[in-house]
Structures are given as C-alpha cells and as structure tokens.
Interface confidence: medium
C-alpha cells in the first residue's frame, strides 16, 4: 500500500487557446485530469487502474502551481494504491479548459482539452521526487512525481507491514526495511520476551519485564544464584536448595554439632597443648608448673616432691632448694653418707648393701616409695584422670571419678547414648551433648522413629508443570522447583496477567 | 449489547484435542483485539491467549506451542485450538476483547462475559 504524488509546478500557455487552435474566451481557466494505470509500451485509452484525480481551476493560461501540501490542499497530488508498487506505470495528464464552475467531463464541450501528456516507465519507491517537463508546439508543463509508501508499510514494494506497539502483542518499532526493531528491554521474534536484569540465573529466575530477576522456590539474591540452605541450618552451606552441608568442625543435621571445640573455644590455658576428644569434649596437656582441667592452676616446684631421702624443700624464686635430713647430701639429698646398719629403711622397706657397703638401696612394701620408703605412694600425682575427671586414692589403687558423659578407667571414652541403637526403622542416631536424636528414614517419625508416618512427600508428585520436588526433611513436606513460566507452591499458576488488563 | 457465546468445551484424555469458538452477536468486532480466558477452580481468572486486529498473537507461555489463536472476520467469531491437552488445562474457557495500547479500546458493552465453556481433561 503507498501513494504515487504528482506535483504540478508550472503550466505555459502563453497564446491561451485550446489543443484544437481556437482561443480561449476571454482566457483559458485551466484545470487537469490525471489517469495513472499499469505499464503499456504505448500508453492508450483505457481504465485508470492504478486511479485517477482531478485537481480545481489552478489558473489561467500561464501560471506556476502554489505547492499545497502544508495547508492541506491538492498539490502534491495524492493517487493511493492498495497493492504492491510494481516498479512500472504508465501517467496521463490532460489538461482542460473550464467556461464554467461544472468540471465533470459530460459538463465540458468535447474541445475544452488544452493539451494532453502521456508518460511511462520504471519507478522504484524512495522519498526523492522526479522532476520531468513536457512540451508541445502551443504548451509546456513541469511538474515532478514520486511514489512512497503509506503509513505503517515498508519496503522496496511498500508490501511490508509493520505497525510499532509497545503491548501485550509486542514491544518494537519498523526499520525501514519493515523488520522490527524491539525496544530496549525486549527480545524475541516479536519483542514479545523480556531481558531479565544483566546475570540473573537462566533456570533459578526469571522475569515478566525487562531487568526484573525473581527467584524461583529455593534460591534467594539479587541474580537468584545463591541456594536457600535447610531450615535451621547452623554452620552450613549448600550447594543446591535445602541442603545442610556442616563447615570444618561442625556436625549433625543441622550443623549445630561442635566437633573441634579446641579451636572455637581455644579453653587450654597456661600455653597447654588441646585435643579433641569427641563432641564438645577436650583434653588439655600442660606445660610444666601448671595443673588443672584447663591447665588454670599454677603448680609450686615443690608440688612434685623432688627431695628425696625425706628432705623438706623450700620454693625459691628460681626454683627451689632441698633441705637434707642427717646422713644425706645432694641436690635432691640424693647421695647417703649411711649404710643399711644405720637402718634408714622406713615403713618395712628392706636395705640392700651396695658398692661394698659404701652404699645401699630400700626395697619398699606396696604403697610406699622413696630411696627410704619414706613416702607414701599418691597414685594421682600423674593427673591420670581425662575429661575433667577426678582422681580419688584407694587404699593400694586409684581410681576414676567421671563427669558426666564419660567412663572408662581413666574416664577416656565418651559414653554414647547411640551405643544401645534406639533408632527403630534404620533411623540414624546421633549423640548430642545431652542425649541423643533420631534421624527418620521416610516413613517414620517421632523421637525415636517408632511413628509410620506417609510416605516420602514427593511420592506423590505434586508438582506441576514438570517442577522438581524436593522433600524438606525438617517438616516431612515436600517444596517444588519451577521451571521458568510458572510459580506457586505446586507450580501451579503460570506468569501470566491478572485478571484486569493492565496492557 | 454484545453477546458472546462460547461453545466446544468437553471432556477429553489427557494429550487429546479440543477446538473452542466464540461468536459475537449485537456488534462487530473486527477493530479490537479478542482473548481467549481460562479459570481454574479456586484460581483467578488468567489470559490465555489473545489476538489483535492485525492479526498479532500474544499465548502464555503454559500454552506457547499448544494452543493456536485465530479470527473469521466474515463470522465474526474468534477460534482457539487446542492440541496436546494436559490436566492442568482443566478450567473453564471464556472470550473477551482486552484492552490493548495498539488496538482502539474494546466498547463498554464489550465488559460482560459469557458463561464461558467447561473444558476437562482427564489423565
């Protein structure tokens, strides 16, 4: 669909008479008929089939034509066609004489025609007009053509149509070859799918106008690219949703299991080298002088009873000093200047002569110790109790009071509340600080998993639109992934409009 | 006033085909745009697929490649075809002319809705 546009720009009928001869009275009101129709070598008579107009009297004999367009007159003329240009035509310009206000032809005496051009050949749609004159022996007209296309169509034909629409149907306006060009935020082969904001997750968002992200069930942040952790979950991560993936030295379901309380509590003082012994358990080893759980007391030198031989020690500010009882000399009144006749052998100890007599040793009797089996045997001294626990001398033994959640001679095994398997169904028994804790199988439930509960959640597949399921273990209900185009807990309600039409 | 009046609803298995129709009575509607909508019980009202009058065509993306929009001007009636039915296409179907920024507004006497046809799909 276009328009062929004529211009007449001016006419030349210096004598004012007519195609026949005869002069005009008393000028020649000078009007034109125009036919325009398809290509013919020789244009002749015939339909108009591309269509015809006709202008009012423009002037008399000689004149130049106002160009109209501006005030909405009749020059350019306007001849519109509802096909495609064929690149090819054939132009009829009459010229007429009118005697009076009547200008249809059967109005006219048959010799009223002026002059009469006829014109054919190529011409490609474009915006740049052809300027033409044609002259005869009385006459000359100039005037200049072109054809464009109407609104809306495109094109070397004017056969492409395109209307620009930013709605529901589409978001583009026309290039000039009629291909769309979408408006920024839109892509598609109708402008019709909108960009979503620049790095927004291909399958964990989407958008319904341009640089929006939403998250799809399960992932959360700007660009929908980081996963939603299991509820509750502590000191974990995850790498796709509902996952509880425990961080170095965390455990349990949750995460909220401290298995390297050495290194989270730092509870070893003084310098003391921690290890971990379970859940929330530790054992501290000192550095000399310091005793104590948490290696907190400061141990007097004296504390270890280095004189020997019964000599009495005294700390010092650099250390400390042994007072050595008669007959005994020495850094730790190691050294006797007795002999087994001066009967230095305490609490039963035997004397043994050594060095021919220069010299002897006590062999003491259970529970007591010494180079003179003056010491009573304290079988704690070693701090042999771990985990806190408390050592207690018996008589001839030692023994082990334990802290709670622990056992073992030397109090060294952490008691699990696992160990009796309370978990009925398969469930997998977890100790906790204070207690223990079910993890059910599906199906089950309760403290123990004693409970038959539904099957896995998921098992019914109440997602929709081909969403995936996941079963969220902390709640025995299922959550659904959704694919792009839909939302709703089940998936259900694509991303369409609301019931009004907001386009 | 406009009576639009829908019909070739049924009960169809599940990857089966249904073809609706909608036909204008009291008015022409050949300027405006027509869309076909569906609701599910319990759910809103949603725009399932809509066509303009220079024959663009806007489906939800739930529909896209399924369904297919159309218009007999001589008719005046708007068609949808339906192909590859699913369950969750169960609802019932109803025509209307939304508004549309390219296409002149609908007249007023294009806001009452019909009964609209019952469309099941069973599994």
């Known amino acids: 669909s276009g328009v062929f546009q004529l211009q007449l720009q001016e006419f030349i009928n210096e004598r004012g008479v007519l195609a026949s001869g005869r002069p005009c009275e008393p000028g020649c009101r000078t009007f034109f008929r125009v036919c325009l129709k398809h290509f013919q070598a020789v244009v002749s008579p015939g339909p108009c089939t591309f269509g015809t107009v006709s202008t009012p009297v423009l002037g008399t004999n000689s004149f130049a034509v106002r160009d109209d367009s501006s005030g909405g007159g009749r020059n350019p003329l306007q001849l519109p066609f509802n096909f495609t240009w064929p690149g090819t035509f054939s132009l009829i310009i009459e010229a007429w004489h009118a005697p009076g206000d009547d200008l249809r032809p059967e109005a006219l005496p048959p010799d009223a025609l002026i002059s009469k051009i006829a014109i054919q050949g190529s011409l490609a749609v474009g915006q740049n007009w052809l300027l033409d004159e044609q002259t005869s022996t009385l006459t000359r007209l100039r005037y200049s053509y072109r054809v464009i296309c109407s609104d809306n169509y495109y094109g070397d034909n004017c056969s492409r149509l395109c209307k620009k629409r930013n709605d529901h149907f589409g978001h583009y306006v026309c290039q000039p070859d009629g291909n769309l060009s979408c408006l920024p935020g839109w892509t598609g082969e109708y402008c019709q799918q909108p960009i979503c904001l620049s790095g927004c997750h291909e399958q964990n968002g989407y958008c319904s106008k341009p640089a929006e992200c939403l998250c799809r069930p399960g992932w959360q942040g700007r660009l929908c690219n980081e996963c939603i952790p299991h509820n509750g979950c502590r000191h974990g991560t995850c790498s796709t949703p509902w996952q509880c993936t425990c961080d170095e030295g965390w455990g349990g379901l949750f995460c909220d299991q401290d298995l390297n309380y050495c290194t989270h509590h730092s509870p070893c003082k003084n310098g003391a080298t921690c290890s971990n012994s379970g859940q929330r358990s530790y054992t501290c080893t000192c550095r000399p002088g310091y005793t104590g759980v948490d290696c907190e007391l400061e141990l007097s030198e004296c504390d270890s009873n280095p004189c020997r031989n019964g000599g009495s020690c005294k700390d010092q500010e650099d250390g400390y000093h042994c007072l050595c009882p008669p007959g005994y000399y020495g850094l730790h009144c190691e050294h006797s200047t007795l002999s087994c006749a001066d009967s230095p052998c305490f609490n039963g100890g035997s004397c043994r002569e050594r060095n021919q007599g220069a010299n002897y040793a006590c062999e003491c009797p259970p529970n007591f110790t010494g180079s003179n089996c003056e010491k009573k045997v304290d079988r704690c001294t070693s701090n042999p109790c771990a985990n806190g626990g408390q050592c207690l001398n018996r008589g001839p033994s030692r023994m082990c009071r334990c802290r709670p959640g622990f056992t073992g001679t030397y109090c060294e095994l952490h008691v699990s509340d696992c160990a009796r398997n309370p978990c009925a169904h398969g469930g997998t028994c977890h100790d906790l600080e204070n207690g223990l804790m079910c993890t059910c199988p599906a199906g089950f439930s309760g403290r123990r998993c004693e409970v038959r509960t539904s099957i896995d959640a998921c098992a019914s597949s109440p997602c929709f639109n081909r969403a995936t399921c996941y079963t969220d273990l902390s709640t025995d209900t299922f959550v659904c992934n959704c694919p792009y185009g839909f939302v709703g807990s089940r998936c259900e309600f694509p991303v369409g409009l609301p019931p009004s039409f907001p386009w | 006033e406009v009576q639009l009046v829908e019909s070739g609803g049924g009960l169809v298995q599940a990857g089966g085909s249904l073809r609706l129709s909608c036909a204008a009575s009291?008015?022409?509607?050949?300027?405006?745009?027509m869309g076909w909508y569906r609701q599910a019980p319990g759910k809103q009202r949603e725009l399932v697929a809509a066509?303009?009058?220079?024959?663009?065509?806007y489906y939800a993306d739930c529909v896209k490649g399924r369904f297919t929009i159309s218009r007999d001007y001589a008719k005046n009636t708007v068609y949808l075809q339906m192909n590859s039915l699913k369950p969750e296409d169960t609802a019932v179907y109803y025509c209307n002319a939304p508004h549309s920024d390219y296409d002149e507004e609908a007249p007023s006497d294009f806001g009452s809705w019909g009964q609209g046809t019952q469309v099941t799909v069973s599994s």
């Open positions: 066509i303009s009058s220079d024959d663009s065509t």
């Open positions: 009291g008015s022409t509607f050949t300027s405006y745009a």
